[in-house]
């Protein structure tokens, strides 16, 4: 019997896919260089996670040319291990790389509020259950509330935590109609928020703060227009907020003369030319004062030289 | 609790001053509040005077001009009303009363004194 | 100063009717308006504040609503005790001032 040998080049994958983190949304090449006996009919082929790539490689999805495997808007689901697959009649061998789909956090699944009896004292607990990190550590998670009556459509911070918590007490302000969300934040940014939670009203209170910026000063001879920034909503502690203005000639030591108005201002009429006058802004709502407010120094109206 | 008790002479001749005193117990007026005077006119409406607060600082209704001048007493715990010039037209009920809140309308009145201007 | 008009300045309702009253500010006065009950030879008794909330024992039936320069005060079911004069009231800003009153009369 005679036989005949052929030896043949083994088929080598000379460059091989590498493994690689990348960003949700964006794109990854992965390439494949093989050296083939000469004789032979090459193929290379792609395969992700054990499905063959190569009828998908002409979708929007995929895209596959000469040794190289584009995969197009990456997402969580893409993540795995894809294989260059180099063959011949006689051999096949494979190199395997690993994608990794890094980006912000996932949503935060649920949220839930408890220790409602502390309401009284304008506290909660919220608690949540965490967010899928997407291969990069949860840094914070970001509680956040908005007022539907108030400022609706409008989140506000109310802190943040360590990602490694997943309940946290609250200090809340009085009279706030809260409903509150929570976001996980990773080093590529927040994740899509939680579902809102149910709505809380904390009770009233007297304001804490004063108007700041209290200003006087004449835009005619014989008066004064005080005016000050108004509290913003949060800090009203009940539905309404009013102002109690209250204005002396500076050096006396008489009793003040004061108005109770809601617009932030008050023109003082029938003063003096150009006199200084104590002037103090006080924050009123249906539950009291705010603090005893600071003085401020305004003047009246000027007048031409005699 | 709280209780308003308005004193004064019924009767006040034209061009004279009115003047009318509110004892306050049950409250000390030097705590919190306004303490204010309100009219009421034959015909039944009311006027808001004026007041003067729990620190002693004042506000008093543009339309009186200058005929009105509210003081207190903290040492008794009254409150004073002194109305100047007074004609027919001042012939009210008057009535002390305590804001409720600083503002936000007025939850405490004494029970009233009819005060008439004449000759 | 803001002017208050209430209307109507009086009415005639039996015992179990719903009564309704209204007062129109002047000017814009947000929700600063609070409702009294007069009874004869008898100081005003606060009932609303605020527009809405019910003062301190004052009974469910009655309610304030509005917002801007129109604000309406409701009797739900009229009690015996309840017929006498009402008034509304600006919270709004010093002077404060008054509406002319709504008698609320036996039928």
């Known amino acids: 019997i005679m036989a005949n040998l052929k030896v043949k080049d083994a088929t080598q994958i000379t460059q091989g896919p590498r493994s690689t983190i990348e960003k949700k949304g964006s794109r990854v090449t992965f390439t494949c260089q093989a050296s083939f006996d000469p004789s032979l009919q090459p193929s290379i082929t792609w395969r992700g996670d054990g499905r063959d790539l190569q009828e998908l490689g002409d979708s929007d999805k995929y895209f596959i040319e000469d040794g190289r495997l584009v995969i197009h808007s990456l997402d969580y689901s893409d993540q795995g291990n894809y294989s260059c697959v180099a063959s011949t009649e006689l051999d096949v061998v494979e190199s395997r790389a690993q994608l990794l789909v890094v980006g912000s956090p996932g949503p935060v699944p649920r949220l839930v509020l408890s220790d409602l009896h502390l309401l009284t004292q304008s506290q909660v607990r919220v608690s949540w259950s965490p967010a899928e990190d997407h291969n990069a550590p949860i840094e914070k998670y970001d509680i956040e509330f908005e007022d539907k009556e108030m400022a609706p459509e409008k989140w506000y911070s109310l802190g943040k935590v360590p990602g490694n918590q997943t309940s946290t007490t609250l200090k809340l302000s009085p009279y706030v109609h809260y409903t509150f969300r929570v976001t996980a934040i990773n080093k590529y940014g927040p994740g899509e928020p939680s579902p809102v939670s149910e709505t809380v009203v904390t009770p009233e209170a007297a304001p804490e703060k004063n108007p700041v910026d209290v200003k006087g000063e004449g835009n005619e001879t014989t008066n004064m227009v005080i005016t000050w920034k108004p509290l913003r909503w949060m800090d009203w502690n009940a539905p309404q907020v009013q102002y109690r203005v209250q204005w002396r000639p500076q050096g006396t030591r008489g009793p003040w003369q004061e108005q109770i108005v809601s617009d932030p201002f008050l023109v003082v009429s029938n003063t003096s030319t150009f006199v200084p006058y104590e002037i103090k802004v006080q924050a009123v709502n249906s539950q009291g004062k705010g603090p005893e407010p600071q003085v401020t120094i305004g003047y009246s109206g000027e007048d031409y030289p005699q | 609790q709280v209780q308003l008790q308005e004193s004064g002479p019924g009767l006040v001749k034209p061009s004279q001053t009115l003047s009318l005193t509110c004892t306050v117990t049950?409250?000390?007026?030097?705590?919190?509040?306004?303490w204010n005077w309100i009219r009421q006119f034959p015909g039944k409406g009311l006027e808001w005077m004026g007041y003067?607060?729990?620190?002693?600082?004042?506000s008093y209704n543009p339309s009186l001009k200058s005929r009105v001048t509210i003081s207190r007493d903290t040492s008794k715990n009254q409150f004073s009303l002194k109305l100047s010039s007074v004609t027919a037209a001042d012939t009210a009920v008057y009535y002390c009363?305590?804001?409720?809140?600083?503002?936000?309308?007025?939850?405490?009145w004494g029970q009233g004194t009819l005060v008439t201007v004449s000759s | 100063d803001i002017q208050m008009t209430q209307s109507p300045s009086s009415l005639s309702a039996s015992v179990g009717d719903r009564v309704t009253i209204t007062c129109k500010a002047s000017?814009?006065?947000?929700?600063?308006v609070a409702w009294y009950q007069q009874k004869p030879g008898k100081a005003p008794k606060l009932l609303i504040y605020?527009?809405?909330y019910r003062y301190t024992g004052v009974p469910s039936r009655f309610s304030g609503s509005g917002s801007g320069t129109d604000f309406t005060f409701t009797i739900s079911s009229l009690q015996p005790e309840d017929f006498a004069t009402y008034y509304c009231?600006?919270?709004?800003?010093?002077?404060?001032?008054f509406g002319g009153g709504t008698k609320v009369e036996i039928k």
């Open positions: 009363a305590r804001s409720f809140s600083y503002s936000y309308g007025f939850a405490y």
């Open positions: 049950g409250y000390s007026i030097t705590s919190d509040y306004t």
């Open positions: 003067i607060s729990y620190s002693g600082s004042y």
């Open positions: 000017q814009d006065v947000s929700s600063a």
């Open positions: 605020s527009a809405s």
């Open positions: 009231q600006q919270h709004y800003s010093t002077p404060w001032t």
